[in-house]
Interface confidence: low
């Protein structure tokens, strides 16, 4: 059973002769009269295993210990640290020539874990030990222990375990703890990649090349990577990894943003608080959502502030001018937040009896500079019927107004166009044709202008050529022309008048009147 | 230092309403939620559910829901409890008790600061 | 709810000896459990959160212990300041409830 001690984290032990409860049992040779295994107390009342010689007095020693079968776990290379005392020679009377002050470390590699003796042919030296200066002073109880300390490393291995053994030639020896590791490089997170334990290489100057793994919740930057030097310390960290969105390092893990925080992309930066205008329910948040009635527009960066749209254009003026209208507002009141605020011109042609019948005015309507992403605050629109009436609504619009429409976004006027001159009378026509009589009847204009005042007919015989016409003018939309010749072409014009003046006089109808005392009916433009 | 101060006692009939303060001091009032616990005489603690300092939103245990209302005033850093239509069983001391609202270490929660309680009482 | 059981509900103890104080949950709370201390007038004291750490300030004869359904509150040896009653508190999922207290009698 091996009890824990703390070495450092990147030895691993494979024996620590303090860690073994009970008697060691390691096979001495001769099997009496050179090692021994002799408990000791220390000043904490744990008992320490030694193994003692002590043969100065007689000449030739050649006396053996050696350990248990010792695994490699993998390990190449293998360090021994051996804490011992050592009697000064001189310090023991009448040892002269007899009495020495070293004694060798021996190893042999075996992939049998139970051999009984010692076979001294086997074993190969790893080197000659001696004691120096350099011991600490040890408290056992009512003795102080000189205790040297020596390390030596042996490789490269390739069995599947060792045995050590210790040579004697004459010496006074204590030894009071054998302890054999391995170093590695402990397993570490460096630029937020993990990498594993690593055994150190077989020779005490190579590298050995290691490539990280991305901890939780990151992402490879550039390949990370790191080499292991024969000390089991990490050298020479190349690439890294980045905490993905939703997380920032904090003591070398990407932990998820706290709540109210984000993070949008896989970066080293930290969380950042959310914009404003926006919150996040859940750790881990890669945006904010936004508060309720602001929005993000799809290129507003997750950084950018939660936005609105605007409220309505202020201080709507209208000036008339015949069939053209200036508009001329003020920016709103509230912007949203946004720079991109422009303007987009409604126009909807509405009926003077009843102004909710509205349809929109089409495409004849001519606006400058434009109709729809205005920039300015003022707009012209020509091209508009004349004496009609119209609503125009400035609608304030900027990046997230499509996600919100909302009607207090537009401010809207209705105006009256001028009264124009009436359109030209497309239809005239002779409805009944005596010998000395026409009656005439016509159409509205298509385009009346405004309130058509009256409407005048002139006409004249064919053969006059319009040298000497007459004028009759009507309220209503028909008239009976009499006093004419009997059997004579005559030609018939007629226009309407608005306020405004007349209109353009309608293509000729040429009518020829009857020769008999009857009446000829007629509808079509030219009767004969 | 860090202390929650809560408004003094209040003796009210059955039917009536009381609005109890707690006021935060020594530290940022909307980086801890602010929680309610009622003690009846000579029984346990029993939690009242919270408010979260930051949006105002509360949350109310089954048994307080309805007749109960957290309420907060950041700008004198004050959360505030209301019992509308009170009965004799109302009868208590209610404390006021914070929790950090954000995690930054440990996810492990506790009170560890309370305020010194305040007894309502309702007798007619 | 998670229901919070503390026994005994009484505990007499001499001056310098150790108390011993449980509190089951009526499901896993994952080490989710806080120990409070109050003596009469006074506000609730945190003692132990996260089933064993000490609070700020709190002696170090106060420790907590447990897992799972069963913890356990130690006072390794009562002084005359720490006869008062003892309450356990989950934070796993809401409603956080209390134990219904221990309280801690001189013998």
């Known amino acids: 059973v091996t009890g824990s001690r703390v070495y450092p984290a990147n030895e691993v032990t494979l024996l620590d002769s303090r860690s073994v409860q009970g008697e060691l049992g390691w096979i001495a040779s001769p099997l009496e009269g050179g090692w021994e295994e002799v408990s000791i107390m220390d000043e904490k009342n744990t008992p320490i295993r030694t193994y003692q010689v002590c043969n100065v007095m007689e000449p030739s020693q050649n006396n053996w210990l050696r350990t248990d079968w010792i695994t490699r776990e993998g390990a190449q290379r293998v360090y021994i640290e051996i804490k011992f005392t050592l009697r000064d020679c001189n310090s023991l009377p009448g040892v002269m020539g007899t009495c020495k002050e070293t004694f060798n470390l021996y190893y042999y590699e075996s992939d049998n874990d139970k051999e009984r003796f010692i076979r001294e042919n086997q074993f190969v030296k790893i080197d000659t030990i001696a004691a120096d200066e350099s011991f600490t002073q040890v408290d056992i109880g009512d003795r102080i222990m000189k205790l040297n300390t020596e390390i030596r490393d042996v490789g490269p291995l390739s069995k599947k375990g060792f045995y050590l053994a210790f040579q004697d030639v004459g010496a006074c020896i204590a030894l009071v703890s054998v302890r054999v590791f391995y170093k590695k490089c402990p397993l570490t997170v460096r630029n937020l990649a993990q990498f594993p334990d690593t055994i150190t290489g077989a020779d005490t100057s190579s590298l050995v090349e290691v490539r990280g793994s991305c901890v939780n919740n990151s992402e490879e930057k550039d390949v990370p990577k790191m080499y292991c030097g024969a000390d089991g310390e990490w050298l020479v960290p190349i690439g890294n990894c980045l905490c993905n969105a939703g997380h920032e390092e904090r003591s070398g893990e990407c932990q998820a943003c706290k709540i109210g925080y984000y993070k949008a992309l896989s970066t080293d930066a930290t969380c950042a608080k959310c914009p404003p205008h926006s919150y996040s329910v859940w750790e881990g948040a890669t945006s904010c959502t936004c508060d309720r009635g602001f929005f993000r527009a799809d290129n507003d960066a997750a950084s950018m502030p939660c936005t609105r749209p605007p409220s309505a254009p202020l201080n709507l003026i209208s000036n008339v001018n015949e069939t053209s209208v200036n508009l001329e507002w003020s920016s709103p009141q509230n912007t949203g937040g946004r720079q991109d605020i422009s303007y987009n011109v409604v126009c909807k042609k509405c009926g003077a009896g009843d102004p909710s019948k509205c349809r929109p005015c089409g495409s004849g309507v001519h606006y400058t500079p434009q109709q729809n992403g205005l920039k300015t605050t003022k707009v012209s629109i020509t091209d508009l019927l004349a004496h009609t009436n119209y609503t125009f609504e400035i609608w304030a619009v900027n990046g997230v107004s499509k996600y919100n429409p909302n009607p207090d976004q537009s401010v809207s006027v209705t105006v009256t166009t001028n009264q124009a001159a009436p359109s030209s009378i497309a239809l005239v026509q002779a409805k009944e044709v005596t010998r000395y009589s026409v009656a005439l009847a016509w159409l509205e204009p298509d385009r009346p202008n405004g309130v058509i005042l009256e409407y005048e007919v002139k006409y004249y015989e064919k053969d006059q050529n319009e040298r000497s016409y007459r004028i009759v003018r009507t309220a209503a939309r028909n008239t009976d022309i009499k006093g004419l010749n009997p059997l004579t072409s005559y030609v018939f014009h007629v226009r309407a008048r608005t306020a405004a003046g007349y209109g353009d006089f309608s293509e000729p109808l040429e009518v020829t009147t009857n020769t008999v005392p009857s009446r000829i009916i007629g509808d079509g433009a030219n009767s004969t | 230092q860090i202390q929650l101060v809560q408004s003094g006692s209040e003796l009210k009939k059955p039917g009536a309403s009381v609005k109890v303060s707690c006021k935060a001091s020594?530290?940022?009032?909307?980086?801890?939620?602010m929680h309610w616990v009622r003690q009846a005489p000579g029984q346990g603690l029993k939690w009242m559910g919270w408010?979260?300092?930051?949006?105002?939103?509360?949350t109310y245990a089954d048994d307080f829901k309805g007749r109960f209302v957290f309420s907060l005033d950041t700008s004198v850093s004050t959360a505030y409890l209301q019992i509308s239509s009170l009965k004799a069983e109302d009868t208590a001391v209610y404390y006021c008790a914070r929790i950090p609202l954000y995690y930054y270490g440990s996810r492990y929660w506790y009170f560890d600061v309370w305020g010194q309680g305040t007894t309502v009482t309702v007798s007619s | 709810e998670i229901v919070m059981t503390q026994s005994p509900a009484t505990l007499s103890v001499s001056p310098g000896e150790r108390a011993t104080l449980s509190c089951r949950a009526s499901e896993n709370i994952y080490r989710n459990l806080a120990w409070y201390q109050q003596k009469p007038g006074q506000s609730p004291r945190l003692l132990i959160y996260?089933?064993?750490n000490l609070a700020d300030g709190i002696p170090a004869r106060f420790s907590g212990s447990g897992s799972g359904t069963e913890y356990t509150l130690t006072i390794s040896s009562l002084q005359s300041e720490d006869f008062a009653v003892y309450y356990c508190q989950h934070f796993w999922g809401t409603p956080w409830t209390f134990g219904q207290g221990t309280k801690v009698e001189i013998k």
């Open positions: 408010i979260n300092t930051e949006t105002g939103e509360p």
């Open positions: 996260a089933a064993t």
């Open positions: 020594g530290y940022t009032f909307t980086d801890y939620s």
